[in-house]
Interface confidence: medium
Amino acid sequence: HNTTVFQGVAGQSLQVSCPYDSMKHWGRRKAWCRQLGEKGPCQRVVSTHNLWLLSFLRRWNGSTAITDDTLGGTLTITLRNLQPHDAGLYQCQSLHGSEADTLRKVLVEVLADPLDHRDAGDLWFPGESESFEDAHVEHSISRSLLEGEIPFPPTS
């Protein structure tokens, strides 16, 4: 898998899209996970609704949301109030039993808010470190939550 780079600005929302073959992955739940190391595990951040037919419902874990357009074949992840430590390598996954197929590898890059006059030295961001040949950059700054959309409280 090539890796797609999504760039967002700290404090704003970032939408990550993962297209897939809707027929091939029919009936499968999806997940968003964070790669912890080169050969380490991909730690689950959030997954779609337990009932596949309700995958269109947005599910939250902290500031991260996931929703799945199962007909159109697009998994969408929203990182709300993007923070420097949200940067890193992630995967969109299609789940079947105890197995998971990688739909897309995603590198999230967090840029300092140019309008934020706090000292950037007080911010910390993590980084990216695997060899990603032909990485594709998508500047994807998404809108904020719609009024009435209430995320689950953050998890520790």
Epitope: T3, V5, Q7, R34, Q35, L36, G37, E38, G40, P84, H85, D86, A87, G88, L89, Y90, L107, V108, E109, V110, L111, A112, A120, D122, L123, W124, F125, P126, G127, E128, S129, E130, S131, F132, E133, A135, V137, S156
Partner: antibody, heavy 119, light 107 residues
Framework: EVQLLESGGGLVQPGGSLRLSCAAS????????MAWVRQAPGKGLEWVSS????????YYADSVKGRFTISRDNSKNTLYLQMNSLRAEDTAVYYC????????????WGQGTLVTVSS | DIQMTQSPSSLSASVGDRVTITCKAS??????LAWYQQKPGKAPKLLIY???NRFTGVPSRFSGSGSGTDFTLTISSLQPEDFATYYC?????????FGQGTKLEIK
């Protein structure tokens, strides 16, 4: 094989300037966040500065803020650290390092270059 | 800022010994901890990330454990090449903080 090779260290007087370079090979440099970490003689490790893989954002430790500038040239696979207004307490071995995705730990380091600030 | 305190600062042991180095955080850092090994005149090398995951090529005699504020690096059976200085590091969240180091010497 990942290789990071620092250069540019040396003896400089207080108030002087120095530019460190780090030549990277063995990986796709433009896809990596990079950092400088230093170690004063006989002391522990201290993070100095970092920047995103595109170079779009830079970050500095309080101790060097306003004096040091980190940059990169992805076409040359090279990381830089411009050090101005140097002080005696900046004397250290400076390591170029890359970090694993989104985690803040450094998986590969250069061999280091010694910067000595003394009159 | 969160402080990382290692103990002991120095330690003498023999080849074959089981050695434990501890790292204490001044606040809860979850499992966000890494360990490095550094030999004199050399760059640090990553050993363990996220408390217990061994980095590529690190021998199985090295293991990490702990969570919250108390962490441990264990070397199950010391080898001659293990005599070095070991550092813990808080990772993932700011600021990046290293412990002061533990020097492991031959008894």
């Amino acid at each position: 094989e990942v290789q990071l090779l620092e250069s540019g260290g040396g003896l400089v007087q207080p108030g002087g300037s120095l530019r460190l370079s780090c030549a990277a090979s063995g990986f796709t440099f433009s896809n990596y966040y990079m950092a400088w970490v230093r170690q004063a003689p006989g002391k522990g490790l201290e993070w100095v500065s970092s920047l995103t893989n595109s170079g779009g954002s830079t970050y500095y430790a309080d101790s060097v803020k306003g004096r040091f500038t980190i940059s990169r040239d992805n076409s040359k696979n090279t990381l830089y650290l411009q050090m101005n207004s140097l002080r005696a307490e900046d004397t250290a071995v400076y390591y170029c390092a890359k970090e694993w995705a989104g985690s803040g730990y450094f998986d590969y380091w250069g061999q280091g270059t010694l910067v000595t600030v003394s009159s | 800022d969160i402080q990382m305190t290692q103990s002991p600062s120095s330690l003498s042991a023999s080849v074959g010994d089981r050695v434990t180095i501890t790292c204490k955080a001044s606040q809860n850092v979850g499992n966000n901890l890494a360990w490095y090994q550094q030999k004199p005149g050399k760059a640090p090398k990553l050993l363990i990330y996220y408390t217990s995951n061994r980095f590529t090529g690190v021998p199985s005699r090295f293991s990490g454990s702990g969570s919250g504020t108390d962490f441990t690096l264990t070397i199950s059976s010391l080898q001659p090449e293990d005599f070095a200085t070991y550092y813990c590091q808080r990772i993932y969240n700011s600021p990046w903080t290293f412990g002061q180091g533990t020097k492991l010497e031959i008894k």
